[in-house]
C-alpha cells in the first residue's frame, strides 16, 4: 500500500482543517497553556518498523477521532469543519486498517509495542482530564486544538517508520 | 537549524517610512508566533508586539499601539515591523523572537540578530 | 498591563559567588516567567522558561523558582562569561512585559 503518501496527503488535509477550526484569539488563552506531554522523547528514541508505526499511528488518529466526536466538541466546533475534519481522520483511519490487513496478513495488529500505545492513551487522558478540569471552555479547546496540532506535526519518527520494510 | 534573519541596519531622517524584516527558516512558520521587542541605546527590553503568521492575527503593547504596524507573509516566512512616519525617539535595536503560541514549549527560544535603526535629521 | 519589577537593578560579584536576582510581578503570573541574558550587542538568549525550566544548551549553573507573582534566578557558582544583563519576562496575558534588568558585573 502506498500509505506515505497517502496519508501525507491526508495528514496535511486535516492539519489544514484544524488550523481552519479556530474560533477565539489565541491571544486571549496564553494563561491556560498546559503541560501535556506528548511522548515525543520515547518516539524520537525508537526507529519504528513498519507495522509498528501503523499501530501507533491508528492509535492516534483513533483518539483524536474520538476526543472531537463527543457533545462538548460538537458545540465547541463550527459544524461543518468538525464535519471535513472527523471525515478526514476517518479516512486516515481506513486507509491504516486497509494497510496492517496487507502488511501483515490478518486483521490485527501486533501487539509489539503496546507500550507506545499505551503513552499514546494515556496522553489523550491527560488532554480529556484538562478539558474537563476547565469546564470544556473555548480556551481549554483552543490550548486543545494547538496541541493536537503540534503532536499530529511531531509524530515524524512514526511516518518515517512507514517508508521502512519491515 | 532554527533560524531567525533580520534586515540590515537602517539609517533614515524624521518623517520617513520604514519596513524592517525578520525571516524565519529551519522550522514551520505558521506554527510559531512572532514577537517584536525594542532596546533604545542603553536601555532595557521594551515589548512592541506579537503577530500569528497563520492568520496574521496581530496584538500590540498600548505604548506601541498605532506607532508601528506589524505583518507576515507566511508564503515566504517573513514578518515584518513597520513605520509610516519615523521619529528620532525611533532610534533604537530591534529583536524579532519566536514564541510557541498556546504549546507547552519555551517562549521566545530563538532570536534574530536585531536591526539597528537610526532616525536622525 | 502587568508590570515586572527586578531587584537588585545591578549587584557586583566575583567568580564563584552565588548569585540572586529577584523578579516580583504586579499579579499573579502563575508560573509564566522566563529569564533572559544579554551580553553587549548580542541578542537576549533563554535561559529559563516556565519560571524553573532549563532550556536546552543552558548550564545547569541556572535555575529558576517562585509561581504567582515571586520569582527568583540563581546562579549556583558565577563563571567569567556569566557577567551580563538578566531580565524576566511575563507571558501570562498579553501585552507581555520585561523587568528592567538586573546588570551583573564583575567585583
Known amino acids: 500500500c502506498d500509505l506515505p503518501q497517502t496519508h501525507s496527503l491526508r495528514n496535511r488535509r486535516a492539519l489544514i482543517l484544524l488550523a481552519q477550526m479556530g474560533r477565539i484569539s489565541p491571544f486571549s488563552c496564553l494563561k491556560d497553556r498546559h503541560e501535556f506531554r506528548f511522548p515525543e522523547e520515547e518516539f524520537d528514541g525508537h526507529q519504528f518498523q513498519k507495522t509498528q508505526a501503523i499501530s501507533v499511528l491508528h492509535e492516534m488518529i483513533q483518539q483524536t477521532f474520538n476526543l472531537f466526536s463527543t457533545e462538548d466538541s460538537s458545540a465547541a466546533w463550527e459544524q461543518s469543519l468538525l464535519e471535513k475534519f472527523s471525515t478526514e481522520l476517518y479516512q486516515q483511519l481506513n486507509d491504516l486498517e486497509a494497510c496492517v490487513i496487507q502488511e501483515v496478513g490478518v486483521e490485527e495488529t501486533p501487539l509489539m509495542n503496546e507500550d507506545f500505545i499505551l503513552a499514546v492513551r494515556k496522553y489523550f487522558q491527560r488532554i480529556t482530564l484538562y478539558l474537563m478540569e476547565k469546564k470544556y471552555s473555548p480556551c481549554a479547546w483552543e490550548v486543545v486544538r494547538a496541541e493536537i496540532m503540534r503532536s499530529f506535526s511531531f509524530s515524524t519518527n512514526l511516518k518515517k517508520g512507514l517508508r521502512r520494510k519491515d | 537549524e532554527v533560524q531567525l534573519v533580520q534586515s540590515g541596519a537602517e539609517v533614515k531622517k524624521p518623517g520617513e517610512s520604514l519596513k524592517i524584516s525578520c525571516k524565519g527558516s529551519?522550522?514551520?512558520?505558521?506554527?510559531?508566533?512572532i514577537g517584536w521587542v525594542r532596546q533604545m541605546p542603553g536601555k532595557g527590553l521594551e515589548w512592541m508586539g506579537i503577530?500569528?503568521?497563520?492568520?496574521?492575527?496581530?496584538r500590540y503593547s498600548p505604548s506601541f499601539q498605532g506607532q508601528v504596524t506589524i505583518s507576515a507573509d507566511k508564503s515566504i516566512s517573513t514578518a515584518y515591523l513597520q513605520w509610516s512616519s519615523l521619529k528620532a525617539s525611533d532610534t533604537a535595536m530591534y529583536y524579532c523572537a519566536r514564541h510557541p503560541g498556546l504549546n507547552w514549549a519555551p517562549d521566545f527560544d530563538y532570536w534574530g540578530q536585531g536591526t539597528l535603526v537610526t532616525v536622525s535629521s | 498591563d502587568i508590570q515586572m519589577t527586578q531587584s537588585p537593578s545591578s549587584l557586583s560579584a566575583s567568580v564563584g559567588d552565588r548569585v540572586t536576582i529577584t523578579c516580583r510581578a504586579s499579579?499573579?503570573?502563575?508560573?509564566?516567567l522566563n529569564w533572559y541574558q544579554q551580553k553587549p550587542g548580542k541578542a537576549p538568549k533563554l535561559l529559563i522558561y516556565?519560571?524553573?525550566s532549563l532550556q536546552s544548551g543552558v548550564p545547569s549553573r541556572f535555575s529558576g523558582s517562585g509561581s504567582g507573582t515571586d520569582f527568583t534566578l540563581t546562579i549556583s557558582s558565577l563563571q567569567p562569561e556569566d557577567f551580563a544583563t538578566y531580565y524576566c519576562?511575563?507571558?501570562?496575558?498579553?501585552?507581555?512585559?520585561f523587568g528592567q534588568g538586573t546588570k551583573v558585573e564583575i567585583k
Open positions: 516556565f519560571a524553573s
Open positions: 499579579q499573579s503570573i502563575s508560573k509564566f
Open positions: 503577530i500569528d503568521p497563520s492568520d496574521s492575527d496581530t
Open positions: 529551519g522550522y514551520s512558520f505558521t506554527s510559531y508566533w
Open positions: 519576562q511575563q507571558s501570562n496575558t498579553l501585552p507581555f512585559t
